[in-house]
Amino acid sequence: LRPSRGNTKRALTLKDILNGTFSYKTYFPNWISEQEYLHQSEDDNIVFYNIETRESYIILSNSTMKSVNATDYGLSPDRQFVYLESDYSKLWRYSYTATYYIYDLQNGEFVRGYELPRPIQYLCWSPVGSKLAYVYQNNIYLKQRPGDPPFQITYTGRENRIFNGIPDWVYEEEMLATKYALWWSPDGKFLAYVEFNDSDIPIIAYSYYGDGQYPRTINIPYPKAGAKNPVVRVFIVDTTYPHHVGPMEVPVPEMIASSDYYFSWLTWVSSERVCLQWLKRVQNVSVLSICDFREDWHAWECPKNQEHVEESRTGWAGGFFVSTPAFSQDATSYYKIFSDKDGYKHIHYIKDTVENAIQITSGKWEAIYIFRVTQDSLFYSSNEFEGYPGRRNIYRISIGNSPPSKKCVTCHLRKERCQYYTASFSYKAKYYALVCYGPGLPISTLHDGRTDQEIQVLEENKELENSLRNIQLPKVEIKKLKDGGLTFWYKMILPPQFDRSKKYPLLIQVYGGPCSQSVKSVFAVNWITYLASKEGIVIALVDGRGTAFQGDKFLHAVYRKLGVYEVEDQLTAVRKFIEMGFIDEERIAIWGWSYGGYVSSLALASGTGLFKCGIAVAPVSSWEYYASIYSERFMGLPTKDDNLEHYKNSTVMARAEYFRNVDYLLIHGTADDNVHFQNSAQIAKALVNAQVDFQAMWYSDQNHGISSGRSQNHLYTHMTHFLKQCFSLSD
């Protein structure tokens, strides 16, 4: 007799996850006009595409790329030159240095002479022509043409002291979320940049062990909560005659300059109009300032009547960041997302004052991002459709009509497969690409910007689909639970042969940081997918109070009291999951990374007895140890007359005694520039002082991501062993 060919599918293995066997691809066109884009092919050729003529050709060959070991490129707007980027060397989250080579497309060779110094911290083309701005050793340089000698714009740059055109650590991580702090005007005449003065900022110093006889010390100016902050100044330089008149400083609004403040973003409105956004150190007041170039004074003027104030009375201004304006064609009015009177973030149209703003969207959902404003349309994303906060659909509002008509572009395209979209628009939205991240396999498509008709599938992950055919994937559910007057959305990942009449171990994965979201309708094959598929563990992710896109009442609940409701809501959810009947109460664990490590630690130390064990990777242990911009946004200042008491009460160390009855695994990279190893060192010290047994693992010379191949393999293997031991699962 032949054995029956029943279920031949196999479970995921940890090796699959660590090798990235089931990673997906996305396709973002690199738009170079209304109907043309570039894309790097599988074999590393840079290919030019014209949607309308359907022509495509190699603009830059892989052999040219390879000749300088280039991993990235950038075409000049006049299409005469391409910069090639190589020797990528990561610094912090966004920043890196690299070597840049300029290839002359017309002559078919590299530009030689007056070559760019190395390593360069940032480089970009002007929006018109082929001027180059770059930052080297914290100073900004300008080249009128790639083959010309450079002109030095700033001279103040000094390592760890003064940064020109690039942010310091805290601005990069917590305010700008970019590696650059310079912006060309649309016609390439002016260059705006920020100078960050870190001279008075305390230094975080940690050892980098390397291979040498002595470790190196890494020094970073890093303002922790309550510490001295960077001093910021914004300048604009005329790049046509940079030597005639030096950089001109842009004035700070009076109401901002009266106390400590931040610069938050810069948006060019037109060739001689710029919009700057500022924020008070106590981050509930934001000012948007529109400034104009005065030829007669050779200065930038920011009239008081062009200042727009945004204030929050229930928490902090904005979401994670204060939103940026999307200006309309008139270069005066703009669209912006901020909280409406009901506390939901929505699109508003501002013509003269914020008080007279016209609300464009409304409802008990949130507008997330404005992609593009054209003459007749506004494209944005929201989580309105069917009331699921963890979805993202793209909408078009016809702004020519009165009242404006709204159309969901994506809601019904591939309804089961695609519920979480982003988009990439050509210059005036004549065409756009949609990138769907799930819940099914990601797919990228090209669309006509007038009719929204799908023109072409750019990437549909066929190979991934085929390789997943013989894999037993877990079932994923997104649902909500109610407790009192609160609604909590959760994602549950159920083992392949899930049977409600059986009992399963439960692992809670938590992040829970303010304005974050974990319950999203996206596709993923990762460690927790493996735990469900192979080890039969039920995984749950819960968005508690403080998380985003469900209104300010829910978001601002955690204001000035981090570490309370985030934890409480995880515990509430666990109790609800137990009530569902398929969870083994004796085998419940929680794990998290970064903010999630903080929450998992506090949950383990809640004294509820709900958790048998848990893991904290790179946790924050006290908000006094974390960055000023982040900590103070949500907690205020650690001073007696402000919020010192809760800073002290909300530490993990304060709960050391409560770890006695749980198995705790504490993990941290020693070279974590973000959440310093200090955080875990203090937890460990408190646990030792309390004579509480725990497990720990450090990763030498690893940063916040513990991302080097070997470290990552070791980390996930180690955590898997710990969990399996906790859940009494055989190896």
Epitope: D104, F110, R112, E115, R118
Partner: antibody
Framework: DVQLVESGGGVVRPGESLRLSCAAS????????MSWVRQTPGEGLEWVSF????????HYTDSVKGRFTISRDNSKNTLYLQMNSLRAEDTAVYYC?????????????WGLGTLVTVSS | EIVLTQSPATLNLSPGDRATLTCRAS??????LAWYQQTSGQAPRLLIY???SRATGIPDRFSGSGSGTEFTLTISSLEPEDFAVYVC??????????FGGGTKVEIK
């Protein structure tokens, strides 16, 4: 084997012209940038001029700008230096030199040189 | 322009001795520095590039070190054929490409 052979040197009066040539063999000439470097008797080396692999980019030392022109014919594997308005201080042995690798303007092969004497 | 200063101008040594030659740049040249050897009446010969990489066929008694503005060429044990002029060259910031004045290594 890589070979660079200069020719065209000689004795000229101030104000006159000369054209130096450098015949290259043993490597893909069109893939490499080339330079002319000179050495006055008993003195050090002085870089004179540079030309990129395709010929689009040329550079000169200040003292020869406007008088000397570097060029190349990749189909003939030959480098040239047109020297006009010669001066006494241009007297030197002129070497052609091959750049070792793109982006690094140092020289792994040199010719034996050709002597240019400018004298009245 | 970047000026390269070599010292000493002359070095009197015997075969088997260790030779240490210095090249100083007026401003940083990173590691973009090459060393050449020139025997009388001959074309220069590339010894070291990128401050410390030995060119093809160069014996390992020749070594280069340094970065920024201070560079050293070391000949661990002088052979008779090593008595020559040694010249450094920067290719970090150009044009112009610049050479040092040279160090002459003579037999004592």
């Amino acid at each position: 084997d890589v070979q660079l052979v200069e020719s065209g040197g000689g004795v000229v009066r101030p104000g006159e012209s000369l054209r130096l040539s450098c015949a290259a063999s043993g490597f893909t000439f069109s893939s490499y940038a080339m330079s002319w470097v000179r050495q006055t008797p008993g003195e050090g080396l002085e870089w004179v001029s540079f030309i990129s692999s395709g010929g689009a980019y040329t550079h000169y030392t200040d003292s020869v700008k406007g008088r000397f022109t570097i060029s190349r014919d990749n189909s003939k594997n030959t480098l040239y230096l047109q020297m006009n308005s010669l001066r006494a201080e241009d007297t030197a042995v002129y070497y052609c030199a091959k750049e070792k690798e793109i982006w690094n303007a140092f020289f792994d092969y040199w010719g034996l040189g050709t002597l240019v004497t400018v004298s009245s | 322009e970047i000026v390269l200063t070599q010292s000493p101008a002359t070095l009197n040594l015997s075969p088997g001795d260790r030779a240490t030659l210095t090249c100083r740049a007026s401003q940083t040249v990173g590691s973009k520095l090459a060393w050449y050897q020139q025997t009388s009446g001959q074309a220069p010969r590339l010894l070291i590039y990128d401050a410390s990489s030995r060119a093809t066929g160069i014996p390992d008694r020749f070594s280069g070190s340094g970065s920024g503005t201070e560079f050293t060429l070391t000949i661990s044990s002088l052979e008779p054929e090593d008595f020559a002029v040694y010249v450094c060259q920067q290719y970090y910031d150009w044009p112009p490409l610049t050479f040092g004045g040279g160090t002459k290594v003579e037999i004592k």
